[in-house]
Each structure stands twice: as structure tokens, then as C-alpha cells.
Amino acid sequence: QTSVFPPEVILPRGGSVKVNCSASCDQPISLGMETPLPKKEILPGGNNWKMYELSNVQEDSQPMCYSNCPDGQSSAKTLLTVYWTPERVELAPLPPWQPVGKNLTLRCQVEGGAPRANLTVMLLRGEKELSRQSAVGEPAEVTTTVPVGRDDHGANFSCRTELDLRPYVLKLFENTSAPHQLQTFDLPATPPQLVSPQVLEVDTQGTVVCSLDGLFPVSEAQVSLALGDQKLNPTITYGNNSLSAKASVKVTAEEEGTQQLLCGVMLGNQTQETRQTVTIYSFPAPNVNLTKPEVSEGTEVIVECEAHPRAKVMLNGVPAQPPGPRAQFLLKATPEDNGRSFSCSATLEVAGQLVHKNQTRELRVLYGPRLDEKDCPGNWTWPENSQQTPMCQAWGNPLPQLKCLKDGTFPLPIGQSVTVTRDLEGTYLCQARSTRGEVTREVTVNVLSPRYE
């Protein structure tokens, strides 16, 4: 009988092993080893045994010891098991962004490694084991599906192999893939809320606010705001899981008409959009026209208000009849009309919304000069030594200058308090003069002497 020692060997790939072959008889006719592996006999051997060194063992092998004794021929095999750790342990790339609530499939590929029976593949989240499977096939592919939550954002996933040769080799060989970091996101199914003016006047500033709740991670969200072809530049405010983008918008006459306001919130590989129609309009203040802004009294004046062709106007409390963009009326200018305001209000309906404008013009009426009995009495009788204030008011536009003189030299102190003396008595010629001409009026002052009895 032939014996081999050791009967089983686990050795690293490319390693060497010494194997002893022995025969049961003292003087075997022949004793040897059959193997394809490079072998070297270690001398000196014994009468009934030989030691061989097998080197560069690359794969599992079963070298055979044989002996030929008088009682017959026999053989025995030693089992060489080669171990080696995998050459490649790789976790398939994760999606750039993974939606929260959607299952993620982790896939690991393992190339090489032996013995496969002792090779286990694990999928890990950080150091937490998600799945443990045997390595099957070449390359071995292991997959597992895991639900994804917000707390998985930034988590590292990896794949690890374990070559467990215990108790033969007091060692556990581990190979770990490069970790992959998961980026998760949560974009709600609801579109962003867009608050903006429904109508916007040319050359005025409007404010647009776009907001969305339930975003994760909110810091990674991007907002795009545009009105027609005009990209807006919003200021973004972030909340816990919300954002609000606020932008000012100014529109020009070229953009007049209906424009689409678009707000898009992008997160991960998804976008939520809201569109709203904004009507851009031009609405100059109505024109108030007077045939002449300055006229002489008695002149006929046409006051006209004209507004946007689709507007409806009201001129000095009188609506256009029928309601429309033009209203006018005729008046004969009187002194009372001087400084009179003519106000025109216009209403324009833009996409169902009402916008209002107004304009005011003043009329100047030239009249006078005038000296009336009411404002400049022709006769005064005052007691001597009394305190009196001579009054004479000239009217006109432009305001006339007034002089009252006695004998062309002695002035009557108009509007001043005076002590009445004999000198004050007499007839004064009051003259009111403006660029429009002059009028005169005689004013007589009588002084009553006190009676002494």
C-alpha cells in the first residue's frame, strides 16, 4: 500500500508544497510521483519513502504517489487546493440621482478567486451588510434590490468578497470594491406655485415668485424662471424642504402681447414646471387737449380727452358717450374758468383685468383788468381822526397793478390803516393796469369834521 502525506493541502496560487510518498514494504521495487507540476526530489530519502517539492502550483491538482512492492502495485493521491483572492471586485456605477421611494438595484461583479466554494460576496451600505451570496459563474455577478429613502443620501455602497479558508488556513481574506456614493432626491409630483401679475405694463417692474415644497436635498435644486425669451435672474431662498425664487421683471414694448411665464424646478434628473400667461400691455396716460391752454374770456374752448383705442374715458365726471376712448366738450371761457382743472380718467381692460390712468390739464383764462363798485366803492365818507383802511381791489389775469392818485400826485394808501385827516379828502383817480390794458375809476373821499358846540 502507498501512502501520501499530507493527503490534502491548501496553498496560495503559485506556491510550493513538500509531499512525502511512502511504501508499505521495506524495499519497494519502485517508488515515485506522477504530476504535471514541476517537482524536485529532496534528498536523501529513505528506503521506502521519498520527499518531493512541488513548485509554482497555479491550479488545483492531484499528484499521485505510486509504489511497487512484492505483494503488488498501489497508488495514493494528495489533493492540492489552490486559493487566490479575486482579481476584480467592482460595484456597478450607481445612477447619478436616485429618486426617493424607488428601489435601487445594486450589482457587483467578481472576477477570479478560488476556491469558489469558500468565496462569499456581500453588498454593503457603509459597513452594514445588505446581502450575502455565493460567487457563481465567471465573472460572478451578485445583485440585490434595496428601497431608497432620504437618509440614503450621501451613503456609501460597496461590494466585499470573503475567502474563508478556516480552519485549514487561519485566515479570512477580504477584498472590497471602491465605494460609490448615492445621491438621492425627492421632487414632489405637484408643480411649483407661481405668483405673478397676470398683466404687466411696458417699462414697469413686476415681481414674480416661484415656490415649491417637499424638495430633497433642497440645496441641490435649481430654478429656472423665464418670461418669453427673457431669462430672469431670481434670488433663491431655501427653507428646510422648500425653496422660493423671487425675480424682478421689466418688459419692453417689443414684448407686448401674450407671453408665457415659465418656472422650472430641476432636481436630480427630473423637472417640475409651471406655466402662466402674462399679458404685456402699453397704456399711456390719456391726453387732455385744450384748443389753447391760455385764452381770453369769451373764447370758445374745446376740451378733449383721448386715450388708448380700447380704453374708456371719463372727462370731468362725464363719461364718453357711447363709452369709448374719446370725450370732449365745448365751453365759453369765463373768468371763473381760470385755473380750472380738466381731468380725464381712462380704464383699459387687459386680459380681463382693469387698469386705470388719469391726466389733468389746467386752463388759463385772461380777463380784465376790472374795477367794480363791489370791490372798489366810488364814495367813502369817514369822520376826521378816525382809523380807516381804504379798500379797492382790481381783478384780472394777469393781475393788474393798481394806483389811486389825487391831482396825479397824492396817493390813496390802499389796504393800509390810516388816521383820517382833511388832507385825505378829495377825488382820486384809481387806475388798474395790466398787459391787457387799463381801466380807471373815480373814488371820492369825504371827511366829516367833528362838531364843537
Epitope: T277, M314, G317, T347, Q353, L354
Partner: antibody, heavy 122, light 110 residues
Framework: QSVEESGGRLVTPGTPLTLTCTAS????????MSWVRQAPGKGLEWIGI?????NTYYASWAKGRFTISKTSTTVDLKITSPTTEDTATYFC???????????????????WGPGTLVTVSA | AYDMTQTPASMEVAVGGTVTIKCQAS??????LAWFQQKPGQPPKRLIY???TLASGVPSRFKGSGSGTQFTLTISGVQSDDAATYYC????????????FGGGTEVVVK
């Protein structure tokens, strides 16, 4: 000045129905007219408006379900494909006023009809 | 859209008491607000226009106030005839997709 609705009746779902509002004492050429409805036990719901120049605007829920048009004396509301949810009293209202102090026009339902009942039932 | 939020949805008041109904607009509607009273089987009746102007024939116990976004209807010295549903209505916009009326306030007089 008055408005009066007519045309309300019992219809089966999907059968188009046209309601008419007749104006008296004022010209529709100078006013905006609104349609408003009220389901049994519910609040007032604005449907839409037609302007003096025939522009129409609708509540978001009413778009595509209703069409407003007018002649010189009447305003029509067509319910294109009635459903049981359209069972309601339908009112027509003059919806345009002039504020004499500011000179501005504004929307103001100052004149209402008595309403006409539409029942949609299979 | 100019959303109109009316509070409360319903309320009870004793004869002689005071009713206060609030109406809030989601955006500035200046003073373009009207209040309506509606009784069962009748069309709405306009009580107040331009936020505070009393419509002709409306008793002076009805008072409207406010501007911008906050408006109030006050009924002082409530009478049994005031039992009705009250609605606010904005007069600023009739754009597509617009909201015109508040949800209504039912007033029950005890």
C-alpha cells in the same frame, strides 16, 4: 333696467344646453355681462364674462365646458356637455360700473336676473 | 388669480347683536369690493360696492370697510330679516381662471 334668464330645464348628461339672458333698458354694447351659478345648497360660482367688445374670459374650471356669446339684446351661455355636477340655478348679471368720483370703470354685478334652474339627470 | 377667503363660514347672532364678516383677497384689489346678501330662492342683492358705499335702499345698519386685501362687512342692530348668506366679490379682475366670490357666510338670527 332688468335682465332675465331663460332656457333652464331637465337634460340628460351630454346633451348640450343653451341658456339665454335678455337685457332690457340698457345696451349690451356698453356693458360687460357675467354668468354665475349656484348648485343646490352651495355658494355662488362665477362662470365667465363677455365684454362690450365680445372678449370672453372663464373661470379655470369652466374653460371648455361653457361658451358665452351675445347678440345686441341677449347673452347666451352654452353648456357644451352637461354632467350631473352642472345641476344648478344659473344667473346672469350686468357686471360693469363707472365710479364717478375717480372716473374709473370697474366690475360690479349691480343688476341680476331671477335665475333659471338647470337639472342634469339620467 | 385673486382668491377671496371669507370668514366665518357660518355664525349665529341674536336680534340686536352685531355681525362681523371678513373677506381677504390674495392680492391687492384696492377698493373694488362688493358685498351681497342672498336669501333662499332669490338672486343675490348688492348691499355695498366700492368697499364702503351703501347701495340705494340698503339700511344704514350695513357697513363696509377696508381696502387692499382686508375687508369687513358689519351689520349692527341685527334684525330677523337679516338672516341670509352673505358673499364678498372682487371687482378688480375677470381674467381667465379668476376667482370672483368669497365662499359665503351664513348668518342665522336667533
Amino acid at each position: 333696467q332688468s335682465v332675465e334668464e331663460s332656457g333652464g330645464r331637465l337634460v340628460t348628461p351630454g346633451t348640450p344646453l343653451t341658456l339665454t339672458c335678455t337685457a332690457s333698458g340698457f345696451s349690451l354694447n356698453n356693458y360687460y355681462m357675467s354668468w354665475v351659478r349656484q348648485a343646490p345648497g352651495k355658494g355662488l360660482e362665477w362662470i365667465g364674462i363677455i365684454s362690450d367688445s365680445d372678449n370672453t374670459y372663464y373661470a379655470s374650471w369652466a374653460k371648455g365646458r361653457f361658451t358665452i356669446s351675445k347678440t345686441s339684446t341677449t347673452v347666451d351661455l352654452k353648456i357644451t356637455s352637461p354632467t350631473t355636477e352642472d345641476t344648478a340655478t344659473y344667473f346672469c348679471a350686468r357686471d360693469w360700473s363707472l365710479d364717478s368720483s375717480s372716473g374709473y370703470y370697474y366690475y360690479d354685478m349691480d343688476l341680476w336676473g331671477p335665475g333659471t334652474l338647470v337639472t342634469v339627470s339620467a | 388669480a385673486y382668491d377671496m377667503t371669507q370668514t366665518p363660514a357660518s355664525m349665529e347672532v341674536a336680534v340686536g347683536g352685531t355681525v362681523t364678516i371678513k373677506c381677504q383677497a390674495s392680492q391687492n384689489i384696492h377698493s373694488w369690493l362688493a358685498w351681497f346678501q342672498q336669501k333662499p330662492g332669490q338672486p343675490p342683492k348688492r348691499l355695498i360696492y366700492k368697499a364702503s358705499t351703501l347701495a340705494s335702499g340698503v339700511p344704514s345698519r350695513f357697513k363696509g370697510s377696508g381696502s387692499g386685501t382686508q375687508f369687513t362687512l358689519t351689520i349692527s342692530g341685527v334684525q330677523s330679516d337679516d338672516a341670509a348668506t352673505y358673499y364678498c366679490q372682487q371687482g378688480y379682475s375677470r381674467s381667465d381662471g379668476e376667482h370672483v366670490f368669497g365662499g359665503g357666510t351664513e348668518v342665522v338670527v336667533k
